[in-house]
């Protein structure tokens, strides 16, 4: 992520004194962390990342906002309306639907802060719940009662 | 979430002047936001939330840390080693594996802040990547080359 101060008084302040420091932990990138580079098609691969091998395969779509933390979010997009056959991985089985799994993720937006008299006092972080689609899941269709 | 000040100088400060304010948006709870109340078993239901209808069904396990934002995270736990048959919703199909989908989520930990001379200056938020399991996905097994 590009760096931006998170609680920054309008007067300059040494970074060592920032009330909010960001430190990124080096963690090996996990499969959903970035888009799938394999060909995007409605088939379940026998290798590659989880979203390619799934019988409800999906791709990732980047959602970037430089005034938000995290700045980069990825939304899953299903590649098939139905699930792919476990037998072949290449033809659809209409007995199953490929459905998006949604999640309300906590994100933080950078907003101007205002003091008691409405003066600009730097930036504040505003917490929001942001809907992201995490993956596509093969489900049995709902039975309408 | 319970409220705790996020950038709090050691001296008391009016909440309106807090550099970092949290505001929660009322968003309708989505399926993965809380544990499944349906019976936990290795079967794909024809109703209920996505994690019950999936042919790779899962339950949610609460992970609570009051010094972290979000304080509550849920980890998916697969209920079956293989996928459930689309035909019956109850028999396992050994041609598919139920695998966890992992994600490195950005979280924030509350840590004591120290000033230039090592004095305690309140609390800082430390950004970390935290591995969470989002869901269980039905995949074709990897073919070993």
């Amino acid at each position: 992520y590009s760096h931006w101060p998170s609680c920054c008084p309008s007067k300059g302040q040494d970074t060592s004194e920032e009330l909010l420091r960001w430190s990124t932990v080096p963690v090996p990138p996990l499969e959903p962390a970035r888009p799938n580079r394999h060909p995007e098609s409605c088939r379940a691969s026998e290798d590659g990342p989880l979203n390619s091998r799934a019988i409800s395969p999906w791709r990732y779509e980047l959602d970037r906002d430089l005034n938000r933390l995290p700045q980069d979010l990825y939304h899953a997009r299903c590649l098939c309306p139905h699930c792919v056959s476990l037998q072949t991985g290449s033809h659809m089985d209409p007995r199953g639907n490929s459905e998006l799994l949604y999640h309300n993720q906590t994100v933080f937006y950078r907003r101007p802060c205002h003091g008691e008299k409405g003066t600009h006092k730097g930036y504040c972080l505003e917490r929001r719940l942001y809907r992201v689609s995490l993956a596509c899941v093969c489900v049995r269709p709902r039975v309408m009662g | 979430y319970s409220h705790w000040p996020s950038c709090c100088p050691s001296k008391g400060q009016d909440t309106s002047e807090e550099l970092l304010r949290w505001s929660t948006v009322p968003v309708p709870p989505l399926e993965p936001a809380r544990p499944n109340r349906h019976p936990e078993s290795c079967r794909a239901s024809e109703d209920g939330p996505l994690n019950s209808r999936a042919i790779s069904p899962w339950r949610y396990e609460l992970d609570r840390d009051l010094n972290r934002l979000p304080q509550d995270l849920y980890h998916a736990r697969c209920l079956c080693p293989h996928c459930v048959s689309l035909q019956t919703g109850s028999h396992m199909d050994p041609r598919g594996n139920s695998e966890l989908l992992y994600h490195n989520q950005t979280v924030f930990y509350r840590r004591p802040c120290h000033g230039e001379k090592g004095t305690h200056k309140g609390y800082c938020l430390e950004r970390r990547l935290y591995r969470v399991s989002l869901a269980c996905v039905c995949v074709r097994p990897r073919v070993m080359g």
Epitope: L86, Q87, T88, D93, R95 | S85, Q87, H91, D93, R95
Partner: antibody
Amino acid sequence: QVQLQESGPGLVKPSETLSLTCTVSGASISNYYWSWIRQPPGKGLEWIGYIFYSGNTNYNPSLKSRVTISVDTSKNQFSLKLSSVTAADTAVYYCARVRFSDYELNWFDPWGQGTLVTVSS
Amino acid sequence: DIVMTQSPDSLAVFLGERATINCRSSQSVFLGSNNKNYLAWYQQKPGQPPKLLIYWASSRESGVPDRFSGSGSGTDFTLTINSLQAEDVAVYYCQQYFITPLTFGGGTKVEIK
């Protein structure tokens, strides 16, 4: 009665591309899955891959990088291309219909008579 | 891939006697949800293409003489030819269609003793 007939060159040079066509009669190619299977002289059977009229294909991983199966619904034909051939690709090549039920592929029936392709310079 | 192993490689039987061919899969080809074994048997006579005899491990294809029967489940299967006839001289193959890649056994040659 469904009948299949393979056609194509009987001799291919090493490193070149083997090309065969299967002509289907007695059934519409659009209603079934169609497959290629080969049999080296005096040896067993090896499945190469299948195709559906929509173009949906599935190939044997052992040959995947070299195989292309295509379909021509207007001619009621499907074809096999196998690139970069070697002597090990010398075989009788059969085309066959794949039975399909309950959203799954089943057995092969019927088969074409087969055509021998020899890879040699 | 599922490896199909046939035994014996060849078999010589007197006319009118029983011939038994075995086929073993490296993993189960039985699916509990439909109670079926995804296994077929073929007969191949010299200079001819294979001909389907048995599907779902034990269902005889129409037109196939009833002296041919298939049995077994999971990983172990048998093709039995009761009262072997001269026209049964051929190579017999088992094939799994449980999962792609679809695979065949190495074949068993049946001859008259």
